[in-house]
Interface confidence: low
């Protein structure tokens, strides 16, 4: 069964700067990745970035830099201030649309005891929804 992992890290240098990394553990060809915050996209979440293997990357504030790390993983840097700033308990979700597996999504947030800049290695997160 395909799985999605999500890792959230707060940067030590800037407390309002977060790095989100997501990956897809499956054999299919990824056709789209959607990153959202505040819950799953379409369930109250707000889209931060859309990454398409062919047509490129689209991102929206406070996302600062979205990029492909590998053909099956992405990273997203958020820089917020004021109302648009993520907080420590913000939930981030990544949804991978893959052919032929379908859509797989997982969410994660900053580990409760995490120090800025420190984070455990990525582990598979629970799959919230398979469309």
């Amino acid at each position: 069964t395909p799985e999605v992992w999500v890792q959230v890290r707060m940067e030590a240098t800037e407390l309002s700067s977060f790095t989100i990394r997501c990956g897809f553990l499956g054999s299919g060809s990824i056709s789209l990745v959607t990153v959202s915050w505040g819950g799953p996209n379409g369930a109250g979440g707000t889209t931060l970035a859309v990454l398409h293997p062919e047509r490129g990357i689209r991102q929206w504030a406070p996302a600062r830099q979205a990029r492909w790390e590998t053909q099956s993983s992405i990273s997203l840097i958020l820089e917020g201030s004021g109302a648009s700033s993520p907080c420590a308990n913000t939930t981030f979700c990544c949804k991978f649309a893959s052919f032929p597996e379908g859509s797989w999504e997982a969410c994660g947030s900053l580990p409760p005891s995490s120090d800025p800049g420190l984070s455990a290695p990525p582990t598979p997160a629970p799959i919230l929804r398979a469309d």
């Epitope: 789209l32 959607t34 047509r55 490129g56 990357i57 689209r58 991102q59």
Partner: antibody, heavy 123, light 106 residues
Framework: QVQLVQSGAEVKKPGSSVKVSCKAS????????ISWVRQAPGQGLEWMGG????????NYAQKFQGRVTITADESTSTAYMELSSLRSEDTAVYYC????????????????WGQGTLVTVSS | DIQMTQSPSSLSASVGDRVTITCRAS??????LNWYQQKPGKAPKLLIY???SLQSGVPSRFSGSGSGTDFTLTISSLQPEDFATYYC????????FGGGTKVEIK
């Protein structure tokens, strides 16, 4: 070669709404975002917002947030832009354009463009 | 929002002249910049994308350069069909157009 064909000119009363369509032909519709740009008489270009038809994600310029709705119908390869609470300052030519991009980058540009739709707001 | 400032807003030139139009972003946009040409009553036409890449079918007399905040569109030898309005556009964070530069016949 992708072509975008827009609906015809409209005359609207202040306070009403207008819905302009943009039909794509000759290419894959769903994978490319469609943006809407307007140009008031004698003025420059102003990006209003855009939509990625699949999965239907729309984003809007802050200026138009709450007043513009952009949708897409994949079955007919048509994008729509609806602008509400029209005022005389909304008199402009409205263009749709396809966001074309380079894979794995954030380089995007508009090509091709629709022919434009003149919307006149007058009492 | 990222603001794009074009200069000059208009210029007069003759056929054969070298024309330079500049565009400045209010913050660094790397090379996420495009240039368009628009003639009266027509839709804009893409000339240059990604700051310096020439769109297919566009004459080589058009060139673009720059990165960060300062960009330039150059027409090496102005032709009669080049009299038009030119716009820059950033695509780093959403989209913003410059105010335009009208190139008129001297």
């Amino acid at each position: 070669q992708v072509q975008l064909v827009q609906s015809g000119a409209e005359v609207k009363k202040p306070g009403s709404s207008v819905k302009v369509s943009c039909k794509a032909s000759g290419g894959t519709f769903g994978n490319y975002a469609i943006s809407w740009v307007r140009q008031a008489p004698g003025q420059g270009l102003e990006w209003m917002g855009g939509i990625i038809p699949i999965p239907g994600i729309a984003n809007y310029a802050q200026k138009f947030q709450g007043r513009v709705t952009i949708t897409a119908d994949e079955s007919t390869s048509t994008a729509y832009m609806e602008l509400s609470s029209l005022r005389s300052e909304d008199t402009a030519v409205y263009y749709c354009a396809r966001d074309t991009g380079r894979g794995y980058t954030r380089h995007f540009w508009f090509d091709p463009w629709g022919q434009g739709t003149l919307v006149t707001v007058s009492s | 929002d990222i603001q794009m400032t074009q200069s000059p807003s208009s210029l007069s030139a003759s056929v054969g002249d070298r024309v330079t139009i500049t565009c400045r972003a209010s913050q660094s946009i790397s090379s996420y910049l495009n240039w368009y040409q628009q003639k009266p009553g027509k839709a804009p036409k893409l000339l240059i994308y990604a700051a310096s890449s020439l769109q297919s079918g566009v004459p080589s007399r058009f060139s673009g350069s720059g990165s960060g905040t300062d960009f330039t569109l150059t027409i090496s030898s102005l032709q009669p069909e080049d009299f038009a309005t030119y716009y820059c556009q950033q695509s780093d964070i959403l989209y913003t157009f410059g105010g335009g530069t009208k190139v008129e016949i001297k």
